[in-house]
């Protein structure tokens, strides 16, 4: 959470922006928030990145000026003008690249004044895992695939009932680079598991954690999945 | 001095519509919303939805989307607010003010009674 | 949507006396907040915005302050003519909601 004041005059806006991350080949969103002004026309939003002439967006009178957009970010990004009516001037960056990684700023004036913010946006790619029971190998195994990933991350095995036991030895992970030549799908099997417990994938890298879970009765199998991005606002 | 100026009372059957119109000074339509609000006999306020003529949207409150519609005439800086299919329910003050995202100016008000 | 509650329904307060009105949002509105009184027969007027800015011509009496869920509009010395009906509302997200109003009276 990056919170910043602009003096213009007397005057002075809050923006406010928070880190965040964009996943490689999807829609993402840079989060920027300011103080509401009831006079809409006098708002203007600018959107620059570090290291690049020319703008990333600008929004003003009531309507993109993408004049001075620099070619980078040509069609692909996007405010929301309804948000901005209550003071939201998050920029949608449509098709995240490796390259949009970088310090941003969110500048915005008003009637009230001014005011600008920086966040850091992280790009990679994470998704969440998926653990099945392995019927194929000799011994009862789990196996965790999770189909993109980068930079490459680290996997760790974990059970409920072996709590602090060290897997490594009786896992093996590989990853294979995806078509696009940036992302890797992850893949790591854990061998000689016992029913009526609870095993845990855990895959991490930089921008993102993500966990499976599965509990294998004799009954039934459950599955629980989640990610979290680290270090977003 | 900014002034909002709301048309006359109105009296309507269930199931008919009513359009009431809003007329503003100044540099209203050029650099305001223009929301309307209504106020049931002794009960609060609630808002009904709004249009932004420099940013050409309009957004309405889920409880009455599909039953109002908003629409402003920069030329005359007039915006109507058209409630159809109208219930006794309905009956109410409607005002109309210059806002969001808050309300600064307020018209008069326009009572909609709505009986058989 | 956003849930806004005030408390308390009505309050009767002495002419001269300070008057507190609280008003608590469902979930953050951070400072996009705000107030509004109501007279018999009358539009609304708006007294604060931003949780704690003074609406042009409002008297110094009228103070507004909290962010988050919890916000309180303070009246410090109640005049004859500050007897109303008292709204607050959210502007964080829409559709932009009100609270059911504090009518303050005369004890």
């Known amino acids: 959470l990056i919170i910043g004041f602009g003096i213009s005059g007397k005057h002075f806006i809050t923006v406010t922006t928070f880190t965040s991350a964009g996943n490689i080949g999807e829609d993402g969103t840079l989060s920027c928030t300011f103080e509401p002004d009831i006079k809409l026309n006098g708002i203007v939003i600018q959107w620059l990145k570090e290291g690049i002439k020319g703008l990333v967006h600008e929004f003003k009178e009531g309507k993109d000026d993408l004049s001075q957009q620099h070619e980078m970010f040509r069609g692909r990004t996007a405010v929301f003008a309804d948000q901005v009516v209550v003071g939201n001037a998050s920029l949608r960056l449509k098709n995240v690249q490796l390259t949009d990684a970088g310090t941003y700023t969110c500048y915005i004036r008003t009637s009230k004044g001014k005011g600008n913010a920086n966040l850091e946006y992280k790009t990679g790619a994470f998704s969440m895992p998926e653990i099945n029971v392995d019927y194929n190998a000799s011994s009862e195994s789990l196996r965790c695939e999770a189909p993109r990933w980068f930079p490459q991350p680290t996997v760790a095995w974990a059970s409920q009932v072996d709590q602090g036991a060290n897997f490594s030895e009786v896992s093996n992970t590989s990853f294979e680079l995806n078509s696009e030549n940036v992302t890797m799908k992850v893949v790591s099997v854990l061998y000689n598991v016992t029913i009526n417990n609870t095993y845990s994938c855990m895959i991490e890298n930089d921008i993102a954690k993500a966990t499976g879970d599965i509990k294998v009765t004799d009954s039934e199998v459950k599955r629980r999945s989640q990610l979290q991005l680290l270090n977003s606002g | 001095q900014v002034q909002v100026v709301q048309s006359g009372a109105e009296v309507k059957k269930p199931g008919s519509s009513v359009k009431v119109s809003c007329k503003a000074s100044?540099?209203?339509?050029?650099?305001?919303?223009i929301s309307w609000v209504r106020q049931a006999p002794g009960q609060g306020l609630e808002w009904m939805g709004g249009?932004?003529?420099?940013?050409?949207?309009?957004n309405y409150a889920q409880k009455f989307q599909g039953r109002v519609t908003i629409i402003a005439d920069k030329s005359t800086r007039t915006a109507y607010m058209e409630l159809s299919s109208l219930r006794s329910e309905d009956t109410a003050v409607y005002y109309c003010?210059?806002?969001?995202?808050?309300?600064?100016?307020w018209g008069q008000g326009i009572l909609v009674t709505v009986s058989s | 949507e956003i849930v806004m509650t005030q408390s308390p329904a009505t309050l009767s307060v002495s002419p001269g006396e300070r008057a507190t009105l609280s008003c608590r949002a469902s979930q953050s509105v951070s400072s996009n907040l705000a107030w509004y009184q109501q007279k018999p027969g009358q539009a609304p007027r708006l007294l604060i915005y931003?949780?704690?800015t003074r609406a042009t011509g409002i008297p110094a009496r009228f103070s507004g302050s909290g962010s988050g869920t919890e916000f309180t509009l303070t009246i410090s010395s109640l005049q004859s003519e500050d007897f109303a009906v008292y709204y607050c509302q959210q502007y964080k997200k829409w559709p932009f909601t009100f609270g059911p109003g504090t009518k303050v009276d005369i004890k």
């Open positions: 931003g949780a704690s």
């Open positions: 100044g540099d209203t339509f050029s650099n305001y919303a």
């Open positions: 249009i932004i003529p420099i940013f050409g949207i309009t």
């Open positions: 003010s210059r806002g969001g995202p808050y309300f600064d100016y």
